[in-house]
């Protein structure tokens, strides 16, 4: 569909005569009839197959025709057609004299024709005007013409229909040749497919509008490239959906069992060294000057009574200092300037001369000690607490604070490691000298039977239509992740075709 446009520009009839040679009275009031036909080698009588158009009286004798496309569209003249433009045509333009206002052929005088021209030729669709001039004996007509496509028609012969749209059926504008040009964010033959967010995973993501990234089941993240781990997975990751691969230091079905208490909780204080010793179990090796299970207690260096001969101990930031009684000196007041003559032995101790009286030694009664028998005996000195227990003086008595796993007055009894039921999933516990051992039931393994090794529910390939199978470790069942276009627990139903149930 298109329009043949004819722009009449100038008509010259200087003598003001008709084709018959008779002059017009008072002048030739000129109008035009136009006939557009299919190409004929010799222009023949018959229908104006591409259309006809007539003008009103445009002038008298010689005149220029004003461009009137803005006001009513009389010039250029419009000859619309609703078929494929063939590229060739025949054009007949007649100039007629109208003495009155009635321009019908039957109302005109018998010799009202002024001139007639006929041209044939090729004409491609385009915006450019072709200028032509036809001269007869007494008249001259200057005109131009072109063929353009109607709205929504494109191509070399206006045969390509293209109507821009931005709706469910497409999102495009039309190129000059009639091909579709997708609006930004759309693609496909009819620009119906949205272009998803850049980087959106091809398989795991999709979109219903441009720059969107919606995730398929089992996937998450801005680009749907992160798998969703098993529900309840605490300290684990996945490479495919519903997995729970434990981070280092974690174990168990949901990676919630702490196998690296030291790193995760840093229980040892004051720069102590931490050693993992099982699930939620650890040992702290204290730096000098500290004690306690977590080395949380600061040891006073004077607690070990380093000062001899009745010297008094003073704690300092970087150690201790002994204040020696008269007659003694040295770091620990170990050197004496006294002799037995000075009665240096306290609490009934007896003095013995040494080195020809230059020195002495005290022999202490029971319950007293020290180079001058100045100290009561420390019941902890003999380190009576076994298995690393900590000895504490409590007045006249003493007591042992035991490390985990030991009991008894002197921490001499080994608590059964199995008492805490450390073996998961019904594993059998065996006490060993240095700990315990779990014997696991079928389907489980690991130090504490925490790792499930049950049969892979996906082994039987239960999912249809190329769906991805994931094993649900907590229930020994499988989960099918359906591809686009399928539904059902095994992805067995195409979308839009409900299952036919037998009842």
């Amino acid at each position: 569909s298109g329009v043949f446009q004819l722009q009449l520009q100038e008509f010259i009839n200087e003598r003001g005569v008709l084709a018959s040679g008779r002059p017009c009275e008072p002048g030739c009031r000129t109008f035009f009839r136009v006939c557009l036909k299919h190409f004929q080698a010799v222009v023949s009588p018959g229908p104006c197959t591409f259309g006809t158009v007539s003008t009103p009286v445009l002038g008298t004798n010689s005149f220029a025709v004003r461009d009137d496309s803005s006001g009513g569209g009389r010039n250029p003249l419009q000859l619309p057609f609703n078929f494929t433009w063939p590229g060739t045509f025949s054009l007949i333009i007649e100039a007629w004299h109208a003495p009155g206002d009635d321009l019908r052929p039957e109302a005109l005088p018998p010799d009202a024709l002024i001139s007639k021209i006929a041209i044939q030729g090729s004409l491609a669709v385009g915006q450019n005007w072709l200028l032509d001039e036809q001269t007869s004996t007494l008249t001259r007509l200057r005109y131009s013409y072109r063929v353009i496509c109607s709205d929504n028609y494109y191509g070399d012969n206006c045969s390509r229909l293209c109507k821009k749209r931005n709706d469910h059926f497409g999102h495009y504008v039309c190129q000059p040749d009639g091909n579709l040009s997708c609006l930004p964010g759309w693609t496909g033959e009819y620009c119906q497919q949205p272009i998803c967010l850049s980087g959106c995973h091809e398989q795991n993501g999709y979109c219903s509008k441009p720059a969107e990234c919606l995730c398929r089941p089992g996937w998450q993240g801005r680009l749907c490239n992160e798998c969703i781990p098993h529900n309840g997975c605490r300290h684990g990751t996945c490479s495919t959906p519903w997995q729970c691969t434990c981070d280092e230091g974690w174990g168990g079905l949901f990676c919630d069992q702490d196998l690296n208490y030291c790193t995760h909780h840093s229980p040892c204080k004051n720069g102590a060294t931490c050693s993992n010793s099982g699930q939620r179990s650890y040992t702290c090796t204290c730096r000098p000057g500290y004690t306690g299970v977590d080395c949380e207690l600061e040891l006073s260096e004077c607690d070990s009574n380093p000062c001899r001969n009745g010297g008094s101990c003073k704690d300092q930031e970087d150690g201790y200092h002994c204040l020696c009684p008269p007659g003694y000196y040295g770091l620990h007041c170990e050197h004496s300037t006294l002799s037995c003559a000075d009665s240096p032995c306290f609490n009934g101790g007896s003095c013995r001369e040494r080195n020809q009286g230059a020195n002495y030694a005290c022999e202490c009664p029971p319950n007293f000690t020290g180079s001058n028998c100045e100290k009561k005996v420390d019941r902890c000195t003999s380190n009576p607490c076994a298995n690393g227990g900590q000895c504490l003086n409590r007045g006249p008595s003493r007591m042992c604070r035991c490390r985990p796993g030991f009991t008894g007055t002197y921490c001499e009894l080994h608590v059964s490691d199995c008492a805490r039921n450390p073996c998961a999933h019904g594993g059998t516990c065996h006490d060993l000298e240095n700990g315990l051992m779990c014997t696991c039931p079928a389907g489980f393994s690991g130090r504490r039977c925490e790792v499930r090794t049950s049969i892979d529910a996906c082994a039987s390939s239960p999912c249809f239509n190329r769906a991805t199978c994931y094993t649900d470790l907590s229930t020994d069942t499988f989960v099918c992740n359906c591809p686009y276009g399928f539904v059902g627990s095994r992805c067995e139903f195409p979308v839009g075709l409900p299952p036919s149930f037998p009842w």
Epitope: S20, S44, C48, L108
Partner: antibody, heavy 119, light 111 residues
Framework: QVQLVQSGAEVKKPGASVKISCKAS????????IHWVKQAPGQGLEWIGY????????NYNQKFKGRVTFTTDTSTSTAYMELRSLRSDDTAVYYC????????????WGQGTLVTVSS | DIVMTQSPDSLAVSLGERATISCRAS??????????MKWFQQKPGQPPKLLIY???NQGSGVPDRFSGSGSGTDFTLTISSLQAEDVAVYYC?????????FGGGTKVEIK
């Protein structure tokens, strides 16, 4: 009113030529075409061809080409058909008719001219 | 050449009755949606008279009882109510291609 008046009957010998006239009136002669049609006695109509009055362009039926010529005289609004090398089967009534570019068809006809070819 | 075949050759119809004449072209006479088909009436001793042009358009001064129809290769001329003055020979004619050709004619008479 539109009229096409043809010349009178002609009797010719075989091998001779005949020129029939068709005088138009009541319309702009130059704007139209003139057709020529043959009708043998008791027979149907047979198209011979046409001439475009405004530019003299002609179109002949191949069957008559070489023996027929169309001409016009715009000063007298007359069209002519000359048929040469006459044969006995050229005996017929010959009609002129006008036609136009806007497809009404051959809407006005002359009364016909009888040409008899006989030795 | 395009051959035009008319049927029947002759037709006798009662006054006031419908008369139908068919014309078949050896190839389509349509071009750009227009049928290059005409119907003529010829009474004895007279030149032909144009009845129908472009298959279905009535010529100037033609009574309404004459109508034409068809496209492509098959065309029909119908006289809805035959009158005494309609006795004549009717011709179809194509003008799509040179040479223009006529049908053989159909003679219409009163029954």
């Amino acid at each position: 009113q539109v009229q096409l008046v043809q010349s009178g009957a002609e009797v010719k010998k075989p091998g001779a030529s005949v020129k029939i006239s068709c005088k138009a009136s009541g319309y702009s002669f130059t704007a139209y075409y003139i057709h020529w049609v043959k009708q043998a006695p008791g027979q149907g109509l047979e198209w011979i061809g046409y001439i475009s009055v405004y530019n003299g362009a002609t179109n002949y039926n191949q069957k008559f080409k070489g023996r027929v010529t169309f001409t016009t005289d715009t000063s007298t609004s007359t069209a002519y058909m000359e048929l040469r090398s006459l044969r006995s089967d050229d005996t017929a009534v010959y009609y002129c008719a006008r036609d136009y570019d806007y497809d009404v068809g051959m809407d006005y006809w002359g009364q016909g001219t009888l040409v008899t070819v006989s030795s | 050449d395009i051959v035009m075949t008319q049927s029947p050759d002759s037709l006798a119809v009662s006054l006031g009755e419908r008369a139908t004449i068919s014309c078949r072209a050896s190839e389509s006479v349509d071009n750009y949606g227009i049928s290059f088909m005409k119907w003529f009436q010829q009474k004895p001793g007279q030149p032909p008279k144009l009845l129908i042009y472009a298959a279905s358009n009535q010529g100037s001064g033609v009574p309404d009882r004459f109508s034409g129809s068809g496209s492509g290769t098959d065309f029909t001329l119908t006289i809805s109510s035959l009158q005494a003055e309609d006795v004549a020979v009717y011709y179809c004619q194509q003008s799509k291609e040179v040479p223009w050709t006529f049908g053989g004619g159909t003679k219409v008479e009163i029954k």
